[in-house]
Amino acid sequence: AFGISGVQKYTRALHDSSITGISPITEYLASLSTYNDQSITFALEDESYEIYVEDLKKDEKKDKVLLSYYESQHPSNESGDGVDGKMLMVTLSPTKDFWLHANNKEHSVELHKCEKPLPDQAFFVLHNMHSNCVSFECKTDPGVFIGVKDNHLALIKVDSSENLCTENILFKLSET
């Protein structure tokens, strides 16, 4: 499995990093599934959206998510990279005006309706193997990633005690 690289080495003040442009550098419509090929689906229930991790039936259509990619500058005192220290941050929107948010207090992932500019809780640092196998690290809580727990999305702390081959924080992106 793909491991998140040396998380303990780079627990860094992501919330000090700045999005370098108000507009995304690119956007990508994709379905999101877990490393074990379960689909991430979104259902409107009582005027709010619920997020599920489930096996789809054979011909069932996968839900799509709009991933918007933003460039973000490392805090220069952190990275040592100067102007070169760029990360990719993403926001994930399954439907108009709703975005995935990190609720760090509850260790949960929620869908919130909001207007731009989006709050920091809606931004995730992109880690990837290729563009079709990724992990999402909370901008507001370095070392914490979107993951799968009990058939739901949750926030999962990845630290040195784990061997960093954590399949439950890996997601696949596909066009189908």
């Epitope: 690119t26 490392h74 040592g80 070169d84 220290g85 990360m87 640092v125 992109l126 880690h127």
Partner: antibody
Framework: EVQLVETGGGLVQPGRSLKLSCVAS????????MYWIRQAPGMGLEWVSS????????YYLDSVKGRFTISRNNAENTVYLQMNSLRSEDTATYYC??????????????WGQGTLVTVSS | DIQMTQSPSVLSASVGDRVTLSCKAS??????LDWYQQKVGEAPKLLIY???NLQTGIPSRFSGSGSGTDYTLTISSLQPEDVATYFC????????FGQGTKVEIK
């Protein structure tokens, strides 16, 4: 300023081995994916191998799988390409490159000057 | 595996001309495409990333566009220093270069 300096190229006989090194400076090496790309004389560019930040994941061009090994030493800011069972078709300038973004395998933002490997008897 | 096909192989144009280079992918690559410039005797240099984003320090006469399988690099007003070979490169699935387009001055 980002700098990548490749060494280790030279003339080698078919079937023999060679180890290329690339020393990096000017950026936080352990944050970035690193790559080897080659270019045969008068030909185009060909991606050869990739390694993620901590060296735990490596990827290879099919024609070099089982013969080449990419590795890195983050303490020494160095990425390596161990090339075994060399063939004449491996003759090329080998470039080391750095990823564009921390933690992501997108784009080659910076390149070294290249080191020439000639496989010939 | 994704194949990248560039056209033309060689392009000859006059200084000041608008020049268009094409790159076609064998599958949808979702704008995960770069353009690199390589001058004779030099290492390649990143010009454009994610289809249409200009790398820092690259002149604004260079621009990129495209989506799906079809991508374009445009030089709005060709300059003598633009003589080089241009490579497209996809990173949507694996890593693959096109074979290159050599740009010459007439």
């Amino acid at each position: 300023e980002v700098q990548l300096v490749e060494t280790g190229g030279g003339l080698v006989q078919p079937g023999r081995s060679l180890k290329l090194s690339c020393v990096a400076s000017g950026f936080t090496f352990s944050n970035y994916w690193m790559y080897w790309i080659r270019q045969a004389p008068g030909m185009g560019l060909e991606w050869v191998s990739s390694i993620n930040n901590d060296g735990g994941n490596t990827y290879y061009l099919d024609s070099v799988k089982g013969r080449f090994t990419i590795s890195r030493n983050n303490a020494e800011n160095t990425v390596y390409l161990q090339m075994n069972s060399l063939r004449s078709e491996d003759t090329a300038t080998y470039y080391c490159a750095k990823g564009h973004y921390s933690y992501s395998s997108y784009s080659f933002a910076n390149w070294g000057q290249g080191t020439l490997v000639t496989v010939s008897s | 595996d994704i194949q990248m096909t560039q056209s033309p192989s060689v392009l000859s144009a006059s200084v000041g001309d608008r020049v268009t280079l094409s790159c076609k992918a064998s599958h949808n690559i979702n704008k995960h495409l770069d353009w690199y410039q390589q001058k004779v005797g030099e290492a390649p240099k990143l010009l454009i990333y994610f289809t249409n984003n200009l790398q820092t320090g690259i002149p604004s006469r260079f621009s990129g566009s495209g989506s799906g399988t079809d991508y374009t690099l445009t030089i709005s007003s060709l300059q003598p220093e633009d003589v080089a070979t241009y490579f497209c490169f996809q990173y949507n699935s694996g890593w693959t270069f096109g074979q290159g387009t050599k740009v010459e001055i007439k």
